[in-house]
Each structure stands twice: as structure tokens, then as C-alpha cells.
Amino acid sequence: MAFAPIPRITWEHREVHLVQFHEPDIYNYSALLLSEDKDTLYIGAREAVFAVNALNISEKQHEVYWKVSEDKKAKCAEKGKSKQTECLNYIRVLQPLSATSLYVCGTNAFQPACDHLNLTSFKFLGKNEDGKGRCPFDPAHSYTSVMVDGELYSGTSYNFLGSEPIISRNSSHSPLRTEYAIPWLNEPSFVFADVIRKSPDSPDGEDDRVYFFFTEVSVEYEFVFRVLIPRIARVCKGDQGGLRTLQKKWTSFLKARLICSRPDSGLVFNVLRDVFVLRSPGLKVPVFYALFTPQLNNVGLSAVCAYNLSTAEEVFSHGKYMQSTTVEQSHTKWVRYNGPVPKPRPGACIDSEARAANYTSSLNLPDKTLQFVKDHPLMDDSVTPIDNRPRLIKKDVNYTQIVVDRTQALDGTVYDVMFVSTDRGALHKAISLEHAVHIIEETQLFQDFEPVQTLLLSSKKGNRFVYAGSNSGVVQAPLAFCGKHGTCEDCVLARDPYCAWSPPTATCVALHQTESPSRGLIQEMSGDASVCPDKSKGSYRQHFFKHGGTAELKCSQKSNLARVFWKFQNGVLKAESPKYGLMGRKNLLIFNLSEGDSGVYQCLSEERVKNKTVFQVVAKHVLEVKVVPKPVVAPTLSVVQTEGSRIATKVLVASTQGSSPPTPAVQATSSGAITLPPKPAPTGTSCEPKIVINTVPQLHSEKTMYLKSSDNR
């Protein structure tokens, strides 16, 4: 599998409509919770919780602050922690408790605490529960949590130093936790937790499972340095611990290695960054997408692997266990256990088979089973990804978070659209197209290139959004920017399953937002732009330039996968000529203008899609170079594109040339702008109007020229 290509389109922060939320002096917007039925997004930040309109997050509905007292801050600082940063209250748990309340926990100056937030009054109830085991002490420590039927399942550290890891259930009738032992958890970095619903109420009483994902230090591989291993672990919701052995401890805790590697190159991705569980009506069993980086990541590599949950369940219910054996010098080695396995199977959830054998609860499991699972929490079998390979491998990027949406294209094909955020504040949108990865677009969510800490996807039909949280705020982005594709070719070449071209309105529309039937819409996920209607007429721009001056002709081709070149009077322009240059890889500069430069200039793009090359006329300019006579009285003028008053525009219609151009000579390269030749010496007097037109011509666009006096400061 090859590395994923660069994103086809890059949207700068200012180019697209992004909604933002941030409050002055509030940082670390890392906990996001969406209430789809209320159209409310809850945001947990440092010392604050906000409720905002999920359809427009800039609309704040409620806020509540949970600050640390000066006394607590001082005590925290005495223990060597920073009063300005660490000794504050970082909201780490934000979970639904009931229809009217949230369960909130914070680091609380290294004294983790939890409370209930009443959603009607938007006030804390002041319960001030001990958050130990539910929330980390240190804001820098890893954590994960999930609320299951009013009980909080968490993975975090249990002490001030963060040296005691714990996976626990906070429950009034049956609280449980992991053993504090290296075979169970060895310096884990918690990433994600979720419940997988079975059918506990069905006559077979299949227990719900809670899955935990983390990276930990390996016990089974021996190297000079510490090897990190990505893990999937699970516990059973119906677990009540053992009666004597494993009393108040999980009897169902099992863990296995997650494999994500590129078999052909020996490239192993062993640091888990994020996980997303994809549930869809079309999926019998959920699929989970996991985001990885290698342990030694000096080249900026990231990978996404997808797993069938049934693969993991198979490992836990039928796989072999690992066993620790003591070798010379009391050194421990982990090997496959091939001995007899007690019945009921260690770590198994209580099912109808166990009940039939009179094991109706974990409390009456035999000691042999409990002792075995206590000593053998690690499976020998690994959980392998779908197709035994990553869905995506990307170079020169550190991905941080992932969400996935399953959507149907016009032709009925189902695509899993991966939204992956980066440590530079960007969001990549990618799909698998015939065993290759296509990164549809990259959107710069955060202007100051800060890491995205949290990513959330709304699942409500109609208005669909991705929400991203960072240190400075939250950004809301639509799933697609279909309207930004100005032509049918652009819309088709985007190969975005959310977008289709509507010939009647001549716009690229979002499929899930069109109420009208999809009849007549054009979408070609192969990128075959020949399905687009013929453009016999295209608008062009007419410019008047001064003899001897320099002209810049704009060409707004957004595709990073396209090569741009220019034709003049149907001949391809030569790059080596001192006459021309490229600005910003796409715009044409013409130096030392003369009458011979008058004529039709076309900007064309060439883009390889699969095995085809698609040519497009992106912009057309008609240039006329004139010797401007001296005006009687005139200030120095320049014609520039500005927000000033409208003077004139000339948009004309011409036939588009249909011939395929030869290999381009002047073309954009990844190196950026071409060095400009020296400017010609100015001619004439200072009172001559210096006319420079800086337009942004585009097919079917109506960009306007404005006249502005340079005296107007």
C-alpha cells in the first residue's frame, strides 16, 4: 500500500465558512458532548462548562464556572505543581447522566472531583464527589471514560504521581476496578472507551461489553528500549467481581494487541492516538477505526486501521492466553499458554451457557476460573485489521483524532469517510477509492496551527457537522464545502461522496441537504468529468494594460493535484522566456507589455484521475495593451481589486476551445513562484495613469474591477 497523496484541495481558514466558539481567558476546550435531540453542544474547558447551539456554536446558551479555591491552589503549588497552569481545574469527564443532568469531573488542582450539572438551571449540585479513579490528578495524564446506564466506566491514573493506572466502574451497587499489577496494566496511556450493546434483555442474555483502548509498555516483547503496544481491552457490564478471589475486581478483564502495520515494509504503527466506533444500520457488527503513529516518529507518519468488532470478540472468546514464566535471575518472560483452560472460560461474560451450568453471576464463578483470569489477562492472539492492512498511511503529518461517517454516493456505493485532524490544526477528509486513498480536502480549522485535541461528529440527518476542540477554542465545520466547487468539473473531480452537480442550478450541492430527488444530479466517484454537460460558452475577462507595464493574470485552480499552464492565442507559453513568470504557482505574470501581447490568454489545468488526464479551461482573459495618452488633469491612478466603489466591469462570453493542449511548457511546480525578471524602467511622466489590473478571473465568475485613486490614503 502506497502512502496517501496530498489533499486534493486545501481550504485556508478564511476561505470557508467555519463557526468558532471561544471565551476570553478560557483554555483547553478538550471535552465535547453532543446532545442531538436538544441541538446542544456541551463544552468542557479549563474551569468552565458551556452549552452552545450545536447548529451555530458561536451562540452561547449557558455557562458555568468551576474554579479552584486559592487555598487549594496553594496546597497544590506546595507539592511542586505550577499555580498558573497545573493547579487549576481541567474538565476531563463530561458525560450524560440523565435527560436533565451531566456528570462532570475535573482535575481540581490535583484533587480530582466530580459533580452533577443540572441542565435546567445550568448549575452544579455541589456534590463534590471524590474523582479518584474517574479523573486524572494531573491534566497532562491520559484518561478516558464512558457512561453506561448511569454508571461511569473510566480509564485513568489513581494517584497523585500518576503511577497507578486503573480501569474502574463507579457504581452504587457494584463498583469494580483492575488489579494493580503489571500484567493487567503497564504504564498505559488511555485513548478511548465505549460500550458495545449486545442484548442483555433477550432470552439468551448476552452481556453488554465495555471496550477500552490504550497504549502500554509491552510485557511480551523484550528489547533494549521500552516497546509500546496498542491494546484493546474489554470488560463485561454484568461483571460483579468475584466472591473471594478478585473481590471487587473485574473477573472479565481481558486485553489483546491491536495490529496495524504495513506488511511489505515492516512498518509498524504501535502508538494508538484515537479510536472511533462506527455504527451504521448497514453494519451488522460495529467497525472501529483506530489512528496510530509509530513509536519513533521522526518522519511524521500516521496510519488508520479499521477492525471488525467480531474479530476482537473472537480473540477474547476463543483465543489463546499468554502466560508469564520465570526464567533465570527471576526474569519474567511471556509465552503462549497451551495448558488446560478452566470452565467456565476465564474472562468470559456470563451467558446462557454459563447460567445453564448454574453460574448465574460472576460471584459464583469457581476459584480456578478467577485465579486463571487474574494471572492471564493478556491474550496471545492479536486483533488484526480488515484486509490485514491500514486504510490510510500518511507521511509528513501527525494525525491526532479521527471520526468516521458512513455515507452513500448517488450510485448507491457506500463510503466510509474519514475525518482526521492534525497537530497543526487542520482536518483531512479521506475515502478509500478502489484500494487507493483519496484525500478529498484539507481544511485549516485553527488559524494558529495548534493541535486538534478533540473531534466530534454529529449524526443527525440534515445539518451535519464536525466539531473540533483545541487549546484556544472550538470550531464547527460542515462535512463538505460543495458550494465552493464552481464548475461541474470541479464538483466531479472533488470525488466527494457528499457532493453532486445540479445542472438546473449550475451549482455543486450537498447530497444530504437536498430535499429534491437526486434525479438529474451528476456525481462520478471515478472522477470522470466527461459526464459534465458541454460548456460551449464561458465568460472571460477583458483587461486594458499600459505599454511597458507588468500584468498579473489570475487563475484560481484549487486542486493541489493539478498542473497549471497557460496558452496564448492557442500556443503554449514557454517558461524559459524572460517574458513570463508564474506567481503563487498559478497566476501568470507578463513583463514589459507591448501591443504584441494583446490577445486571448487561457489558464488550463491538467489533472490525472486514475489512468485518465482531465484538462480544464480554468480562466480566460482578453488582454489589450494600449499606449495611454496623457490626460489633461489626473492624479496617479491604479486599478485594483478592492472593496471600493464600483466603476466598471467587462464580462464577455466566448466559445471555449475544445482542443487538447500539448504538454505544458509554463507550468506550476511545487517550488512555488518563479523568480521575476527585473522591472523595466518606467516611461512617461508621473501624471500618466499607471494602470495595473489585479483581477481574479474564473469561469462563470463575475469578478469586478474597481478604480481607486492612489491619493486616497
Partner: antibody
Framework: EVKLEESGGGLVQPGGSLSLSCAAS????????MSWVRQPPGKAPEWLGF??????????EYSASVKGRFTFSRDNSQSILFLHMNALRPEDSATYYC????????????WGQGTSVTVSS | DVLMTQTPLSLPVSLGDQASISCRSS???????????LEWYLQKPGQSPKLLIY???NRFSGVPDRFSGSGSGTDFTLKISRVEAEDLGIYYC?????????FGGGTKLEIK
């Protein structure tokens, strides 16, 4: 031997309240879901809902016909199941059965003998 | 709610004869886990219902092998190969795949 025995039935006026009990023996009560079923005279039984076991926090599931009016609870120390009925209507008149739901692939394996409730003015 | 319809309402038989009772559900009663939780109960006069068949065709412990269940999707059948006197009473089908669980209207097996 598994035994279930209902009690507390009788005559009650419309709008009134009544509580039924079901004493269980012969099995570990906390490990089982327990269900209530009623049967009006000469008609088919009607499932009213269940209360889950200890592993599932003794939470409840009700049928729409009784939701909001009837409440299930259990005294696990005494192995007794309760059905609290409020705002009773004439159509609630029936024989009320408690039954064990064992999660063994089938639903109601053991039933009590039933207790009769009549709602009439 | 899933409506369970039983036919016939009444089934007069001679002892030793075969009896067949039909039960039809208003929608598929295949559970999301793939199992079909269709059960048959027998209620004798003055007694509570007793479980005979579960998961369409499995006999509950102690149930004689003259009782058999079959069917799938929405159509199910209970057969008694040779009716005995102790088999008389009202038979109910019962679906426990979807909440609320629902009973059929009953079929009365009586002597001809």
C-alpha cells in the same frame, strides 16, 4: 425447588392503589430478572414488564399499558418481588402472575399461581 | 407492537390424533442477535401457563417429544403428534424478540 407465590390481590375502587407481592424461593433471587404478567378472565395473558437482576442494577422495563402507573421493585434480602399499582382502572382487573426470567434462551420458566385483582366501584 | 394471531381459535381433536396450531406475527420476530424467540405455552384450567417450546423448536425440560415446533420469520406451527388427555387446555404462542413481549390470542384444544 423453585417456588413463586403471589399475594395481595383483592377488590379495589377505580383510581385506587394496590400492592402485590411475590415471594421467591429455591434459587438465587438476585441473579434473575423477574417479570409480571396479567390475564383478564377468559382472555390471553399480557406481559407487563420486568425488573433486571443485580448485574444490571435492578433496573426496570414496562409495557406501555402500565408505564407511569405501575412500579416494580424487589427486596433482595427477603427474595420478594413487588408490584405497586396506582390509578387503577376497571380494565386492570385480572389475575396477576409473577414469573422468573432466567436468561437461559427462554423467557418465563417458572410462574406463580397468580393473585386476583378486581377494580370496580 | 408485534401482533400475534393464532388459528384456529378452537381445535377439537380425538385422543391419539395429530393436532396442529398456527401462529402468525405481524412482523418478523428475528431478534437483532439472529435468534427467533418464539415460545409456546400451555395453560390448563385453573393453572398458570407452562413453557413447552422455546426458540421456535426447542423443547423445554420435561416436555414430551410428541410436542414439536417449527417455522421462521412470521409463520410458526406447534404440532402434537398423538394427543393425550393431559394435553388439553389453551395453547398460547409468545414472542420475546421485541419489547413489548406479546402473546397470541390462544387456541383451545378440546376433545371432539
Amino acid at each position: 425447588e423453585v417456588k413463586l407465590e403471589e399475594s395481595g390481590g383483592g377488590l379495589v375502587q377505580p383510581g385506587g392503589s394496590l400492592s402485590l407481592s411475590c415471594a421467591a424461593s429455591g434459587f438465587t433471587f438476585t441473579d434473575y430478572y423477574m417479570s409480571w404478567v396479567r390475564q383478564p378472565p377468559g382472555k390471553a395473558p399480557e406481559w407487563l414488564g420486568f425488573i433486571r437482576n443485580r448485574a444490571y442494577g435492578y433496573t426496570t422495563e414496562y409495557s406501555a399499558s402500565v408505564k407511569g402507573r405501575f412500579t416494580f421493585s424487589r427486596d433482595n434480602s427477603q427474595s420478594i418481588l413487588f408490584l405497586h399499582m396506582n390509578a387503577l382502572r376497571p380494565e386492570d382487573s385480572a389475575t396477576y402472575y409473577c414469573a422468573r426470567y432466567p436468561l437461559l434462551g427462554y423467557a418465563l420458566d417458572y410462574w406463580g399461581q397468580g393473585t386476583s385483582v378486581t377494580v370496580s366501584s | 407492537d408485534v401482533l400475534m394471531t393464532q388459528t384456529p381459535l378452537s381445535l377439537p381433536v380425538s385422543l391419539g390424533d395429530q393436532a396442529s396450531i398456527s401462529c402468525r406475527s405481524s412482523q418478523s420476530i428475528v431478534h437483532s442477535n439472529g435468534n427467533t424467540y418464539l415460545e409456546w405455552y400451555l395453560q390448563k384450567p385453573g393453572q398458570s401457563p407452562k413453557l413447552l417450546i422455546y426458540k421456535v423448536s426447542n423443547r423445554f425440560s420435561g416436555v414430551p417429544d410428541r410436542f414439536s415446533g417449527s417455522g421462521s420469520g412470521t409463520d410458526f406451527t406447534l404440532k402434537i403428534s398423538r394427543v393425550e388427555a393431559e394435553d388439553l387446555g389453551i395453547y398460547y404462542c409468545f414472542q420475546v424478540s421485541h419489547v413489548p413481549w406479546t402473546f397470541g390470542g390462544g387456541t383451545k384444544l378440546e376433545i371432539k
